[in-house]
Interface confidence: low
């Protein structure tokens, strides 16, 4: 019985199409596949950012694969050919590994890259990113931001920079069509006459960095002798009501502080007839049904009742 062997894929490479971290891994079939014409050859692909403890593993019949990477670090990948057991009378046969790496040659010392990059998607409508210049960089240094997400033909440069001292320290993005629930890639690079500037790469999903507007139209309604219903409305904008969580802060007679997190635009509060003053504020955040993370809105304007009979049907500011 001759041992069945198969070669690894040929021309295995990582290709950077200029999408700021979204890379193509591609390869060609192994040599000498003639013996296995009736067989569908598969490939096991493993890849990771250098320094990561775990490999991502994909088994595919295709000759390419695409995924996002952190270009601040290098990338390593390996692939081998798999012959399923149907082709080899009983046991799966694997080739040796073909390996490749990719990294962007870093320019400049790490301190020159932008510091404290912060991006917020205001009300699921307006993306704004800001940063601080690198440590010790000079006034002639300027930073440029580029971004890409699936659906754009190529990476775009920011067209509306926020400036301080003539330096770009942020970017106001234009309307970003069909940009949520997918990876959003950013590169901030820089130029200086005096020294090379290190580029920085960032990846996030827009729905996870949403800061909503605060709730509006806060009202009180007496439900019974010992219950008051607090109500508010969702703010204007594209975020549907089902996507909100709310946090309420309630003060009774300047002594009790109640905080609660609720999913609806109402909260029922137990009170006593002695309550002389009631105030509450609300803030909102995108919930786990619509995103993996989010940023609390600012607090709403305060709504207060004081000095009157709380049995009045509605108390509206």
């Amino acid at each position: 019985d001759t041992e069945i062997k198969v070669n690894p894929p040929q021309d295995f490479e990582i290709v950077d199409p200029g999408y700021l971290g979204y890379l193509y891994l591609q390869w060609q079939p192994p040599l000498s596949l003639d013996h296995f014409k009736e067989c569908t050859v598969e490939y096991e692909l493993k890849y990771r950012n250098i320094g990561s403890e775990t490999w991502k593993t994909i088994i595919t019949k295709n000759l390419h694969y695409k995924d996002g990477f952190d270009l601040n670090k290098g990338i390593e990948a390996k692939i081998h050919t798999l012959l399923p057991w149907q082709c080899t009378n009983g046991s799966e046969v694997q080739s040796s590994w073909a390996e490749t790496t990719y990294w962007i040659s870093p320019q400049g010392i790490p301190e020159t890259k932008v510091q404290d990059m912060d991006c917020v998607y205001y009300n699921w409508q307006y993306l704004l990113c800001s940063w601080k210049p690198g440590i010790g960089v000079l006034l002639d240094t300027n930073y440029n931001l580029f971004y890409w997400y699936e659906g754009l033909d190529h990476a775009l440069q920011c067209v509306d920079y926020i400036k301080a001292d003539g330096q770009n320290i942020g970017c106001r993005f234009p309307y970003l069509e069909a940009s949520d629930y997918k990876d959003f890639y950013i590169c901030v690079n820089g130029s200086s006459e005096n020294k090379p500037i290190r580029s920085s790469y960032f990846t996030f999903q827009l729905q996870n960095i949403v800061k909503p507007l605060p709730p509006v139209y806060l009202t009180f309604t007496r439900e019974s002798s010992c219950e008051i219903k607090l109500k508010w409305s969702i703010p204007l904008g594209p975020i549907p009501a089902r996507c909100f969580d709310y946090e309420i802060e309630i003060r009774e007679d300047d002594t009790t502080l109640v905080t609660a997190t609720v999913e609806n635009e109402t909260y029922t509060l137990k009170t006593t007839n002695e309550t002389r003053q009631l105030c509450f504020v609300v803030r909102s955040k995108v919930n786990i049904y619509c995103s993996d993370d989010g940023i609390w809105s600012e607090w709403s304007d305060k709504q207060c009742w004081e000095g009157e009979d709380l049995s009045k049907k509605t108390l509206l500011r």
Epitope: D116, D118, S130, K132, P133, L138, L139, D140, I162, A164, D165, G166, Q167, I169, G170, N194
Partner: antibody, heavy 119, light 111 residues
């Protein structure tokens, strides 16, 4: 190392003008703003304004808009502040201070020039 | 103009203890996620020396005994442990908008 050299003292008559100098060395002069700050004896600090030596752009505290004129001579890496129509209220120590940008603070200061206005 | 109010105006703290100086701005000095607040130390006959910039970042060559914190309108400078050499005036300064303004100063003495 970074140095900002200022004359120790100037004595001037009321109504006259004086031009204070600040000679920079140890760094690229045009890469940093030059700020000017006033300090009267036993009093606080007042920011007068700043100049970008690269482009000549100036930002003034409105309070000093008619009092101070900021200029630079790039060839000698020197910043100047001219004070005009001097009164006793202008008697103070005037510092020049290098600043990289709004969020970086004024990281190097001259020793200050003491201006005395008296007849 | 943004007014900065420092407190206390003076304080005396024992050697090795912690000194805390506060600075309150009449309006927020935050912008683009940055707090435009700086702290200076000034000794008699000397120019001010930058200790802290952007609210919490240390000036070059300053000892780790000096730390800054805060955002929006409320900021503080902490010095711990105090040394003899820390006797000085301390000023906060905002650089969010022109005109840049200083606090009135805090005189720190070592007991």
């Amino acid at each position: 190392q970074v140095q900002l050299q200022q004359p120790g003292a100037e004595r001037v008559r009321p109504g006259a003008s004086v031009k204070l100098s600040c000679k920079a060395s140890g760094y690229t002069f045009t890469n940093y703003w030059m700020n000017w700050v006033k300090q009267r004896p036993e009093q606080g600090l007042e920011w007068i304004g700043r100049i970008d030596p690269y482009a000549g752009e100036t930002h003034y505290n409105q309070k000093f808009k008619d009092k101070a004129i900021l200029t630079v001579d790039k060839s000698s890496s020197t910043a100047y502040m001219q004070l005009r129509s001097l009164t006793s209220e202008d008697s103070a120590v005037y510092y020049c201070a290098r600043g990289y940008g709004d969020s970086y603070g004024m990281d190097h200061w001259g020793q200050g020039t003491s201006v005395t206005v008296s007849s | 103009d943004i007014v900065l109010t420092q407190s206390p105006a003076s304080l005396a703290v024992s050697l090795g203890q912690r000194a805390t100086i506060s600075c309150r701005a009449s309006e927020s000095v935050d912008n683009y996620g940055i707090s435009f607040m700086n702290w200076f130390q000034q000794k008699p006959g000397q120019p001010p020396k930058l200790l802290i910039y952007a609210a919490s970042r240390q000036g070059s060559g300053d000892p780790a005994r000096f730390s800054g914190s805060g955002s929006g309108t409320d900021f503080s400078l902490n010095i711990h442990p105090l040394e003899e050499d820390d006797t000085a005036m301390y000023f906060c300064q905002q650089s969010k908008e022109v005109p840049w303004t200083f606090g009135g100063g805090t005189k720190l003495e070592i007991k």
